[in-house]
Every structure is written in structure tokens, then in C-alpha cells.
């Protein structure tokens, strides 16, 4: 049971929030240097499996990026290697160590006073922006039915506190760009759009920056529109049935419809030896239709109890809505009880139901 396509829920995974990393090391390297980061286990105890993350994305080992449980090496560093690095416990995603790395264009050297000054200026309490909940930012494509409310969030931190701005399809995004406007909550790192429409489709990028660096995340929004159509009946239902005289039978019919469907079960009958009327319309009798106390679920099943030979024949599930009708049919074959079959065999004849 659910609320249908536009009203379906995606549950949230439980999260073990890690502490905000208290000690954020600031490191400045020169272009071409080897960046070496080390993260010993807290208190010297066992650390368990860890992952190294840069700007919220897990680092993939390569010839240039050497990843160990307590150490990370990035060889031949370039400007692109600047950013927020953290070592996290793999299971809990708890941040064990956090580093703000800046790679300057000039190669560093032991007597490069500017480099030294720059490193000292940053101080241990300053740092480039980093995502505070990177493990929850992995859902990049959001498919949302029209009329719902969407909130994009890019929770981040850094010192000084970073600013956040938003782009839509690479361009600055402001309230006047959409009917209904937008809500920007800088403290929540969020962008809210109420009652989304198809024109809201696109790529939304948050840009989080301070003087030490910039990080960004792009979400793609798809707004699902429902085009009205007549009811869709699940293929293969109702299915043909063969039953023994006196047994119970159930026919099933699964109906999908945007507009509220009206479901009926019909049995094809003969009138004066004919199955169809003068206009070619089949003769039917209505077996089941919506009543005061019948739910759609109940209407999707037709139950026949203690079937007789008269119950054999063609049955139709008919579903209609404001757009049109759909129907599927199935046959019921009723066989005699086993004793009758045995007697028929002994008499040398075969009964065909």
C-alpha cells in the first residue's frame, strides 16, 4: 500500500554523526611537491578500516595517489589537488583527521620565506571549505513529481565560515528566475523550491567558498509530469483458469490509473443463442461493480464459490476513468468432479469440459 507515484516515500538511512573535527591542520605545498598526510589512530588504539576523502569524494588510489590506512601521499601535486582532505572510519564515516591543503603555483623550497609566511598566516583554526555530511550527498539525481517541494542542501564548514551561492545550468540562480521564487537559507546551506514544475528541470550547483578554497556539488532535478491516459491493465491478468466442479476460483485484475478508475467484472452470456448484439457489442452481465463499501483492492479480485458448469465461460475485467476504458478477458473451464471423470473413463468415453 502506498500513496502512488507522486506520493511515495524514500526512507532515510540511519546515520551515526561524527564529531566536528576539532583540529584542522592547514598545509601549504608547492606545485610538484609530494603531499603527505598522516592520521595516526586516536589514543594509539586500533582504528579499523578507513577511507580518505577529498572535498567530499572518496579518493581512488592510482600511480600518483597512494592510499594507506594511516597515510595518504599525492605525488607531483598541482593546483587541482588543493582542497579539504579527511580520513574517516569506513563504517561510521566519523572524521578522524581533517586537513586543508593548498598547492601554490610556485614550487616550495626550504628557504622560501613567502611560503613560510603563508603557512603561518593560515593558523590552525582556519581552513578551506569541506562538506560536513558527504556520505549523504551521494544522491545526485532527484526525480520529483510535479507540485512537490524540493530542498537542495550542501552542508559545509570552514574557517572563515564559507559563503554559499547557487547556479542553475551553470548560471547564477536567483528568485526572480522562477515563478513562485526560491528560498535561500544560508545558515542551512539550502535552496528551497516549492511546487516544482517542469521548467524547474536542470542542474543545480552549490558553490561553497572562502578565501582558502572552493568546493561545489551539482544535483540534477527531474520533474515528473503525468500525462493522463486510460487505465492500464497488467499483462496476463486475469489469467485463464481450469477448475473442478464445486471448487472456488479467483480471477485477478491489476489496474493502474492516474484518474480514479471504475472497475467492473463482467461475464459474457448468450441471448437467443447469440453472444453479440446487432451492433456487435457482446452480451454481458455485471458480476461486480463499485459499491458503498467496496475498495479498489477488493474490486481487483473476482471470487467464484462452489463453481458449476454454468459458471464456465468468458470473464472480463473492465476499467474506466475520465479518459477512457481498458479491458482484459479470461476463460474459465469447469471440469467434472474426479468420481465423474472415473465413471466416464470406465464407460469408454471422454468428457470434454
Amino acid at each position: 500500500e502506498s500513496l502512488g507515484t507522486e506520493q511515495r516515500v524514500v526512507g532515510r538511512a540511519a546515520e551515526v554523526p561524527g564529531p566536528e573535527p576539532g583540529q584542522q591542520e592547514q598545509l601549504v605545498f608547492g606545485s610538484g611537491d609530494a603531499v603527505e598526510l598522516s592520521c595516526p589512530p586516536p589514543g594509539g588504539g586500533p582504528m579499523g578500516p578507513t577511507v580518505w576523502v577529498k572535498d567530499g569524494t572518496g579518493l581512488v588510489p592510482s600511480e600518483r595517489v597512494l592510499v594507506g590506512p594511516q597515510r595518504l601521499q599525492v605525488l607531483n601535486a598541482s593546483h587541482e589537488d588543493s582542497g579539504a582532505y579527511s580520513c574517516r572510519q569506513r563504517l561510521t564515516q566519523r572524521v578522524l583527521c581533517h586537513f586543508s591543503v593548498r598547492v601554490t603555483d610556485a614550487p616550495s623550497s626550504g628557504d622560501d620565506e613567502d611560503g613560510e609566511d603563508e603557512a603561518e598566516d593560515t593558523g590552525v583554526d582556519t581552513g578551506a571549505p569541506y562538506w560536513t555530511r558527504p556520505e549523504r550527498m551521494d544522491k545526485k539525481l532527484l526525480a520529483v513529481p510535479a507540485a512537490n517541494t524540493v530542498r537542495f542542501r550542501c552542508p559545509a564548514a570552514g574557517n572563515p565560515t564559507p559563503s554559499i551561492s547557487w547556479l542553475k545550468n551553470g548560471r547564477e540562480f536567483r528568485g526572480e528566475h522562477r515563478i513562485g521564487g526560491i528560498k535561500l537559507r544560508h545558515q542551512q546551506w539550502s535552496l528551497v523550491m516549492e511546487s516544482v514544475v517542469p521548467s524547474d528541470r536542470g542542474n543545480y550547483t552549490c558553490v561553497v567558498e572562502n578565501k582558502f578554497g572552493s568546493i561545489r556539488q551539482t544535483y540534477t532535478l527531474d520533474v515528473l509530469e503525468r500525462s493522463p491516459h486510460r487505465p492500464i491493465l497488467q499483462a496476463g491478468l486475469p489469467a485463464n483458469q481450469t477448475a473442478v466442479l464445486g471448487s472456488d476460483v479467483e480471477f485477478h485484475c491489476k489496474v493502474y490509473s492516474d484518474a480514479q478508475p471504475h472497475i467492473q467484472w463482467l461475464k459474457h452470456v448468450e441471448v437467443n443463442g447469440s453472444k453479440v448484439g446487432p451492433d456487435g457489442t457482446p452480451y454481458v452481465t455485471v458480476l461486480k461493480t463499485a459499491g458503498a463499501n467496496t475498495t479498489d483492492k477488493e474490486l481487483e479480485v473476482l471470487s467464484l464459490h462452489n463453481v458449476t458448469f454454468e459458471d464456465a465461460g468468458e470473464y472480463t475485467c473492465l476499467a474506466g476513468n475520465s479518459i477512457g476504458f481498458s479491458h482484459h478477458s479470461a476463460w474459465l473451464v469447469v471440469l467434472p468432479a474426479e468420481e465423474e471423470l472415473v465413471e466416464a473413463d470406465e464407460a469408454g468415453s471422454v468428457y470434454a469440459g
Epitope: Q7, V9, V10, G11, Y256, S257, P261
Partner: antibody, heavy 126, light 108 residues
Framework: EVQLVQSGAEVKKPGASVKVSCKAS????????ISWVRQAPGQGLEWMGW????????NYAQKFQGRVTVTTDTSTSTAYMELRSLRSEDTAVYYC???????????????????WGQGTTVTVSS | QSVLTQPPSLSVAPGKTATFTCGGN??????VHWYRQKPGQAPVLVMY???ERPSGIPERMSGSNFGNTATLTITRVEAEDEADYYC???????????FGGGTKLTVL
Amino acid sequence: EVQLVQSGAEVKKPGASVKVSCKASGYMFTSYGISWVRQAPGQGLEWMGWVSTYNGDTNYAQKFQGRVTVTTDTSTSTAYMELRSLRSEDTAVYYCARVLGYYDSIDGYYYGMDVWGQGTTVTVSS
Amino acid sequence: QSVLTQPPSLSVAPGKTATFTCGGNNIGDKSVHWYRQKPGQAPVLVMYLDTERPSGIPERMSGSNFGNTATLTITRVEAEDEADYYCQVWDSGSDHVVFGGGTKLTVL
């Protein structure tokens, strides 16, 4: 203006049934579900169940399962709540509310009720 | 099934701050909505997704949600804030709506 207008007050005897209607206007009816919530005198809000106006699917609170039926008529943009086998403790104000989906990129999908009907008082008394 | 706990009553002097709490096991892992209900009226949504105000709701209202407690805060309380306040979550396991018991705000 988005509105939910409910049917008038009802007085019923124990064992009877009541059917409350909720007519929607000012928005596209099939884009939002309808929830039913009741409030006994001096008590808090109690969720009963809801219906998808999109496909008629329903979901009921365990407490009311088998005794309540929620339906919709898209041709008139109206939702209905029928409660059977009434007892004196069913005396309450019954509200319908529009169900809105909220999608958060970090937290996922959640539902709330952004528009409410004015309420229908149902009194069950012998 | 989620269980949400709210204190039954709260009294605040005009101009002061009212803080409503809604307790639940790991409620911080869910999104919380808040409703205000004045006597004889239907409830009104005043906060959704923990922190978002619907249009028409004053900036004096703010929300937060962390750990086992969600909070609705009203600063500079006025007489017209007197009402019952309910928190609500969506229980994705059962596809059910769950309300807290409500807190009655009295403005002294």
C-alpha cells in the same frame, strides 16, 4: 485560493456508519494525497489514514484498519472518509488535509499536511 | 513505529522566547513538521522539513532537529501565539503519519 471544504456536522447512534466528504478546490486534485485526522474533545491529533488521489491506493492506521474506508472521486475533486461500527469514543472532529511531498537532497522524501479542511464534528450518542 | 513525546504545557511571558520540544528515538534522522492549532480552528502548518517556514509564517519562528530532539522556537512571543503546537513525522517503515501529543502554549 486552495481550499478543502468538509460536509456538515453529524449525529449518529452507536453501531451506525458515518461518511464525511471533503471537496477540494484551487489546485490540481490528483497531484496531492488526502489524509484524514481526527481530534476527540480535549485530545490531540490522531492520524486515521490517507488515500492517493493519483491511483486510489489507501493506507490506514492500525487502530482503524477494517473499520475505515477512504475513497476519492476525481470527477468532483472530492475525498470521502467512512467510519463504520461507531462507538461513543468516536465522537470527535474529523479533518481532511492535503498531503504534500517534501524532497530533501540529503534526507529523502517526507510527507506533511499543508492545507486542512475546517473539520466535521461527529457525535456518537444513543 | 515512531513515538513522539511533547511536554503537555508551556507558559511564557510576552516578548520572551518559547521553546517547544519533540522527543523521539533518533528523531534527528527524520524530518519533522510542526502545526499550530488555535482553539476551535483547524491546524496550520508552521514549519516543514525541520527548519523551513511556509509563506505567511513569521521569521520569529525557527526550527531545528538533532539527535533525539526536534525543537520549534518562537522569539518575541505575542498573545496571538497562544495555541496548541504539534510535531509530526513520517514513518517510512509503515507509510504512516505520527503526531506528538501536543504542547499547549499559554502567554502569561
